[in-house]
């Protein structure tokens, strides 16, 4: 039986509103909550796309409006739709479109062919894409201030590009309770907003903000050391797209330095923690006298997964560790702001050459076995260590 | 898989001084010492030194202390010896191989160097 | 520094003969690590940590020994076996080699 209804349903997840004239808006299809694929064709009262209209249509993987009215795209229409990767608008009267109307979509194609596109530099993203190849975008016709059918680039004299961000920090080292200024300048055509991220820096600082486009101020208060390594990032944007730009507060504080017990990985190794801004300086002693590496007693850091934060982790690696190497083994850790020294006693192996005149003297009576081998004196684990 | 690269041969004159290259692929170039190692005509193995890429730490065997000079470019993975005055005694085949856990447990081809006027 | 002391300096075996090469530390050290190496070519790893085989190594070799002794068994000697084999100790600066063993097949 043939459909009368305004929508039709096309398969288990389609549907078709083809009936000229008879929608002015998207919102609340019935039955839309598993749509994946939306056709609208012949709607001129259709005219704005806003991102309450797509509102439960989390599904939708293919929208098509086509030979309808629609004049206006909101740039955040799609907000409700992350998984659309099919857009077609062509043939309607769209004179521009937001570079973040698809912002954040894994669009496969756009086709905009038959609108009534007006060339600058709102739409400098699209010939970028165009010109790229990027993602099937099918535009036909870009007007420039006027009909025409070919794409037309916009003139060698017009500068379309996104603001530019720099970020102002201080030139004098910063040290723990300091309270520190940063000013974000923008430059650009055409600004629209522009903003700090500092969802890094919970807890390191207190944050106060201030100022407006082109320039942003923030004062971070009372610092503390837990500011190191941490994003500071200032964005701005403008017709053309979005900046930002990422600073790091480097906070210094002393050194300090943490042992544990030697531990056998693949070899053996005296785990460290080291901390302090600037990155301490390290040194090694064996019973009190400098330490000398070499490639079988030697300083090996942990690749560290996290990278927000100053201290590192390590290894002092001794590869063929014998009784000689037995004793106490400190570790010094240095930076302008302080020192630290932390100590650990190592035992790998007995002397096998010590002799205790008190201890009884083993006689054997039987033949000494020719096949009998030695054992490693230091037994030692095959499994990869990390580092 | 690993492979430590030397150039074939250098030819130098006496008193003049010598750059061997040894060129790291198919591993973490800084997570491994280089050692150098040559070895004279009919001769046994000699130690000469070896760096850790990672922070630059050098040791020297004592007899070349003064003549030797080990370098590294991370950028491109390679390793340098310098040997300076050179005599007829220096012709050698001189051998880079690598260490992290156990010893030398991949060696270059070697780089042949004769000193003759 | 640390002598490593060969012996023999030269030796012969007939295919399946047992072979023993020995290496003497002049001072203690933890572990001994042997090389091959045939003419012309690069030394190759073969045996480290005193007794354990690198990879590829063929089980009829075996190390063995402590302190200031070690050495290098071979179970049953094969054509493949003749070469130069040296000993080396990672214990000391400057790191040393011994003279090497040369293993020729009778």
């Known amino acids: 039986a043939s459909c009368r209804e305004v929508c039709c349903p096309v398969g288990p997840s389609g549907l078709r509103c083809t009936r000229a004239g008879s929608l002015d808006t998207l919102r609340g299809l019935r039955g839309a909550g598993n749509l994946t694929e939306l056709y609208v064709e012949n709607q001129q009262h259709l005219q704005r796309l806003e991102f309450e209209d797509l509102q439960g249509l989390g599904e939708l993987r293919s929208l098509t409006i086509v030979k309808s009215g629609l004049r206006f795209v909101a740039p955040d229409a799609f907000r409700f739709t992350p998984r659309l990767s099919h857009l077609n608008l062509s043939s309607n009267a769209l004179e521009s479109l937001s570079w973040k109307t698809v912002q954040g979509l894994s669009l496969q194609d756009l086709t905009l062919s038959g609108n009534p596109l007006h060339c600058s530099c709102a739409l400098f993203w699209l010939q970028r894409w165009e010109q790229e190849g990027l993602c099937g975008v099918h535009t036909q016709t870009l007007h420039d201030s006027g009909p025409g059918d070919q794409f037309l680039p916009l003139g060698h004299n017009t500068s379309c590009g996104v603001p530019t961000v720099k970020i102002q920090m201080p030139n004098d080292s910063v040290e723990v309770g300091d309270d520190v200024f940063l000013q974000c300048q923008v430059e650009g055509l055409a600004l629209q907003q522009a903003d700090w991220i500092l969802t890094e820096l919970e807890g390191a600082a207190t944050v106060k903000k201030f100022g407006d486009l082109p320039s942003l101020g923030l004062i971070l208060v009372n610092v503390t050391s837990d500011l190191n390594k941490k994003n500071v990032t200032c964005w701005a944007e403008n017709d053309v797209g979005r900046a930002e730009v990422s600073v790091q507060v480097s906070v210094s504080f002393p050194a300090s330095v943490h042992l544990g017990l030697a531990v056998e990985q693949h070899h053996w190794c005296i785990p460290f923690s080291v901390d302090g801004q600037p990155a301490p300086s390290l040194r090694w002693l064996f019973n009190g006298s400098v330490l000398n590496e070499t490639s079988f007693i030697f300083t090996q850091f942990l690749e560290s997964a996290l990278t927000n934060e100053t201290m590192r982790h390590g290894c002092l690696r001794l590869n063929q560790p014998t009784h000689v190497n037995n004793g106490n083994y400190t570790l010094l850790a240095a930076n302008p702001y302080g020192q630290a020294a932390a100590s650990v006693m190592a035992a790998f192996m007995d002397n096998p050459f010590e002799f205790n005149p008190e201890d009884p003297i083993p006689v054997s009576f039987s033949p000494v076995d020719g096949n009998s081998t030695s054992r490693d004196p230091v037994e030692k684990k095959d499994e990869t260590p990390f580092g | 898989q690993v492979q430590l690269q030397q150039p074939g041969a250098e030819l130098v004159k006496p008193g003049a001084s010598v750059k061997l290259s040894c060129k790291s692929s198919g591993y973490t170039f800084t997570n491994y010492w280089m050692h150098w190692v040559r070895q004279r005509p009919g001769q046994g193995l000699e130690w000469i030194g070896e760096?850790?890429?990672?922070?630059?730490?050098?040791n020297y065997n004592e007899k070349f202390k003064n003549r030797a000079t080990l370098t590294v470019d991370i950028s491109s993975s390679t390793a340098y010896m310098q040997l300076s005055s050179l005599t007829s005694e220096d012709s050698a085949v001189y051998y880079c191989?690598?260490?992290?856990?156990?010893?030398?447990?991949?060696w270059g081809q070697g780089t042949s160097v004769t000193v003759s006027s | 520094q640390v002598v490593l002391t060969q012996s023999p300096a030269i030796m012969s075996a007939s295919p399946g003969e047992k072979v023993t090469m020995t290496c003497s530390a002049s001072s203690s050290v933890g572990y001994m690590h042997w090389y091959q190496q045939k003419s012309g070519t690069s030394p190759k790893r073969w045996i480290y940590d005193t007794s354990k085989l690198a990879s590829g190594v063929p089980t009829r070799f075996s190390g063995s020994g402590s302190g200031t002794s070690y050495s290098l068994t071979i179970s049953s000697m094969e054509a493949e076996d003749a070469a130069t084999y040296f000993c080396?100790?990672?214990?000391?600066?400057?790191?040393?080699f011994g003279s090497g063993t040369r293993l020729e097949i009778k």
């Open positions: 760096i850790y890429p990672n922070n630059g730490r050098v």
């Open positions: 191989a690598r260490s992290r856990y156990d010893p030398m447990e991949d």
């Open positions: 080396q100790q990672w214990s000391s600066i400057p790191l040393t």
